[in-house]
């Protein structure tokens, strides 16, 4: 009986990009007093865990702690709430949360085509490249929830590159990029060295956030 209750929320602490062998806590929570939460993962196989809800201050929640992140645990997670024990009457699913393992392959290089210091209003393009044959690059900005992603293209110098047009410069920011292979969308490279883009002038607001959050990174797979 899916959808008897409104969907819970699913969060990742400290975040959904998790370094290999590091800890991540997935937290299901809701203002509905759920007795249990079902944490479902789409990966190489579909797995579901039943978690006991804890009630505090009008909120029910349950934590699933991954003490060491591995490729086998990466994937798209969803949380369902359940009030009755048997049979399960589950809520609508939470919004999907892609848990990505990072730090698996060599880091790409990140550079600003016009240099890291730009004039306000100037068009900014960041280039991510590597000698590794990555199919996809992911560009993250500190403080933004979602990454932009672009397919990598081969260059004559033997590298694979993607150019991210950010539009007219307003605020600066710290950027990082990651490479991945299309058939392992939840497994990313080490982070590039951070690139601090600074804007000279008098900006009023930051670059627009990506219009299409990359919550679905492709067909779920698992690798090692």
């Amino acid at each position: 009986h899916e959808g008897v209750h409104r969907k819970p929320s699913l969060l990742a602490h400290p975040g959904r990009l998790v370094k290999s062998e590091e800890t991540v806590i997935l937290q299901c929570w809701s203002d509905v007093m759920f007795e249990h939460f079902l944490l479902h993962r789409e990966g190489m196989f579909n797995d579901t865990l039943r978690l006991i809800g804890e009630h505090h201050d009008g909120v029910s929640k349950a934590n699933f702690s991954i003490s060491r992140m591995t490729q086998d645990l990466a994937g798209t997670y969803r949380c369902y709430g359940s009030v009755t024990h048997s049979p399960y009457q589950v809520s609508a699913p939470s919004d999907p949360l892609d848990i990505v393992i990072i730090g698996l392959y060599e880091k790409p290089s990140l550079s600003a085509q016009l240099g890291p210091t730009v004039l306000a209003g100037e068009n900014v393009t960041l280039s991510c490249s590597s000698r590794s044959s990555y199919d996809m690059y992911h560009l993250s900005r500190e403080g933004e929830a979602h990454e932009r992603r672009l397919p990598a293209g081969p260059k004559v110098n033997g590298t694979f590159q993607a150019d991210f047009p950010l539009g007219p410069a307003t605020h600066g920011g710290t950027y990082r990029c990651f490479g991945s292979f299309h058939d392992s969308p939840y497994e990313w490279s080490k982070s590039s060295d951070p690139l601090l883009v600074s804007v000279t002038g008098n900006p009023s607001n930051s670059w627009p956030s990506p219009t299409e959050p990359s919550s679905k990174t492709g067909n779920p797979r698992h690798l090692h």
Partner: antibody, heavy 115, light 110 residues
Framework: EVQLVQSGAEVKKPGSSVKVSCKAS????????ISWVRQAPGQGLEWMGG????????NYAQKFQGRVTITADESTSTAYMELSSLRSEDTAVYYC????????WGQGTLVTVSS | QSVLTQPPSASGTPGQRVTISCSGS????????VNWYQQLPQTAPKLLIH???QRHSGVSDRFSASKSGTSASLAISGLQSEDEADYYC???????????FGGGTKLTVL
């Protein structure tokens, strides 16, 4: 250093069952899948199934569905593979390996099925 | 009959470069990454290459691999006598929902 140490060789009668163990050390047992792969004498490798201990749900190759049971004991960092209704064609070396795309492998356990 | 097709044998002389092919379909190599394993006589398989072309830690740079479409290949340059072994390709298969292996290629160093 990741190590997977398997139980010793077994000789079994047709129709019986065998249970092979695989103890992991040097890594995080719960977070990695454990796969079981077998190799008949002079033949290639054949994936039987696997389990991610932290989830506890095993997944099996279609060929072995209903005849194999894969389990994991997080408290002892040990995975088990039980194969039932043994026949002579099940004579093989059985390997446990880390991951659904395995990187580290156990030393193998020879299971001989003979009347 | 293996789902991934490899030549049963390959050979070369010391110092030579040899290539081993692995052919599959859209449900395996075409949509998933390829691993390559080396199995020396009477030992467990050892991972050489993962994610199509990434060498596993400690593997010599004489080993390289690539993937194109539904085929993959492993290249061994500067062939040495200790490379004599069986080599297997492997990939996940979405239709079979499982890991599949090639039939293996026996490499002989002449």
């Amino acid at each position: 250093e990741v190590q997977l140490v398997q139980s010793g060789a077994e000789v079994k009668k047709p129709g019986s069952s065998v249970k092979v163990s695989c103890k992991a050390s040097g890594g995080t047992f719960s977070s990695y899948a454990i796969s079981w792969v077998r190799q008949a004498p002079g033949q290639g490798l054949e994936w039987m199934g696997g389990i991610i201990p932290i989830f506890g749900t095993a997944n099996y190759a279609q060929k072995f569905q209903g005849r194999v049971t894969i389990t994991a004991d997080e408290s002892t960092s040990t995975a088990y593979m039980e194969l039932s209704s043994l026949r002579s064609e099940d004579t093989a070396v059985y390997y446990c390996a880390r991951g659904f795309n395995p990187d580290y492998w156990g030393q193998g356990t020879l299971v001989t099925v003979s009347s | 009959q293996s789902v991934l097709t490899q030549p049963p044998s390959a050979s070369g002389t010391p110092g030579q470069r040899v290539t081993i092919s692995c052919s599959g379909s859209s449900s395996n190599i075409g949509s998933n990454t390829v691993n390559w394993y080396q199995q020396l006589p009477q030992t467990a398989p050892k991972l050489l290459i993962h994610h199509n072309n990434q060498r596993h830690s400690g593997v010599s740079d004489r080993f390289s691999a690539s993937k194109s479409g539904t085929s993959a290949s492993l290249a061994i340059s500067g062939l040495q006598s200790e490379d004599e072994a069986d080599y297997y390709c492997a990939a996940w298969d979405d239709t079979l929902t499982g890991l599949i292996f090639g039939g293996g290629t026996k490499l002989t160093v002449l």
